[in-house]
Interface confidence: low
């Protein structure tokens, strides 16, 4: 996957459902939304190479380490 950043979401949770079985090679960009006052769970939004955006399960094995790295000290953008 390409660049990733922990992003502060605006006012509410972003993901209401997650998509399973996405191959990492299909992902061009990852946004990780940290837990905060707007939403009580970590959320992951993937931009795919076909232009679509989907929500991924942050518990997916291939994502866990990436997410932890981002949340522990990576970039944060508003």
């Amino acid at each position: 996957a390409g660049p990733a950043a922990a992003v502060l979401r605006e006012l509410r949770c972003v993901c209401l459902q997650t998509t399973q079985g996405v191959h990492p090679k299909m992902i061009s960009n990852l946004q990780v939304f940290a837990i905060g006052p707007q939403c009580s769970k970590v959320e992951v939004v993937a931009s795919l190479k076909n232009g679509k955006e989907i929500c991924l399960d942050p518990e997916a094995p291939f994502l866990k380490k990436v997410i932890q790295k981002i949340l522990d000290g990576g970039n944060k953008e508003n």
Epitope: L11, R12, L16, S40, V45, E53, I54, C55, N78
Partner: antibody, heavy 119, light 113 residues
């Protein structure tokens, strides 16, 4: 085919409570939030609140806190809304509506349940 | 709460004409994180529940005829029907989908001459 089937019309007395249901079919019930919307007398729409059927978590419009209570029964793929301490102001058609995913909007709506509060 | 204001409240047009209706929000509906506008449009025909036409301000829901187009950003949005058909007789609502509580406009009633 996606369907949200709501319970039938209700005639209730002031001060009473009513519980209306919304049975989902044709999709994975726990994968989509369920919204409830009030429509008074053919007028505009008021969002009451939303429930996440997977976790039972809710968010309410402040205006309807204490008035509406949202619940789900995962085993029957059914969402419920209970309205309490009813007054004539609560007479309306109430819709359940499935919430979409990444970009929001409510993509499927129940046919509506008419609630009439009258003594 | 975000206030949604629609205009006109009603309009009457002949079949085949182009129609535009406006929706203004009291706060921006643009999410700066993903540069998307959280604005939806619904059509409600007499005796029916609302039906989603447009979400994300401009994305047509699957199955919605391409004569319906949503546009705009921030606080000003427009729904255009390029060539009105008799079956488009309905009330059209816009909805703030950016922040809780979700709020709806008062609606634009479209009548066919």
């Amino acid at each position: 085919e996606f369907q949200l089937q709501q319970s039938g019309p209700e005639l209730v007395k002031p001060g009473a409570s009513v519980k209306i249901s919304c049975k989902a079919s044709g999709y994975s019930f726990t994968d989509y939030n369920m919204n409830w919307v009030k429509q008074s007398n053919g007028k505009s729409l008021e969002w009451i609140g939303v429930i996440n059927p997977k976790y039972g978590t809710t968010s309410y419009n402040q205006k309807f806190k204490g008035k509406a209570t949202l619940t789900v029964d995962q085993s029957s793929n059914t969402a419920y809304m209970q309205l309490s301490s009813l007054t004539s102001e609560d007479s309306a058609v109430y819709h359940c509506a499935r919430g979409m995913g990444l970009l929001f909007g409510m993509d499927y709506w129940g046919q509506g349940t008419s609630v009439t509060v009258s003594s | 709460d975000i206030v949604m204001t629609q205009s006109p409240s009603s309009l009457s047009v002949s079949a085949g004409e182009k129609v535009t209706m406006s929706c203004k929000s009291s706060q921006s509906l643009l999410n700066s994180g993903n540069q998307k506008n959280y604005l939806a449009w619904y059509q409600q025909k007499p005796g029916q529940p609302p039906k989603l036409l447009i979400y994300g301000a401009s994305t047509r829901k699957s199955g919605v005829p391409d004569r319906f187009t949503g546009s705009g950003s921030g606080t000003d949005f427009t729904l255009t029907i390029s060539s009105v058909q008799a079956e488009d007789l309905a009330v059209y609502y816009c909805q703030n989908d950016h922040s809780f509580p979700c709020t709806f406009g008062g609606g634009t009633k479209l009548e066919i001459k």
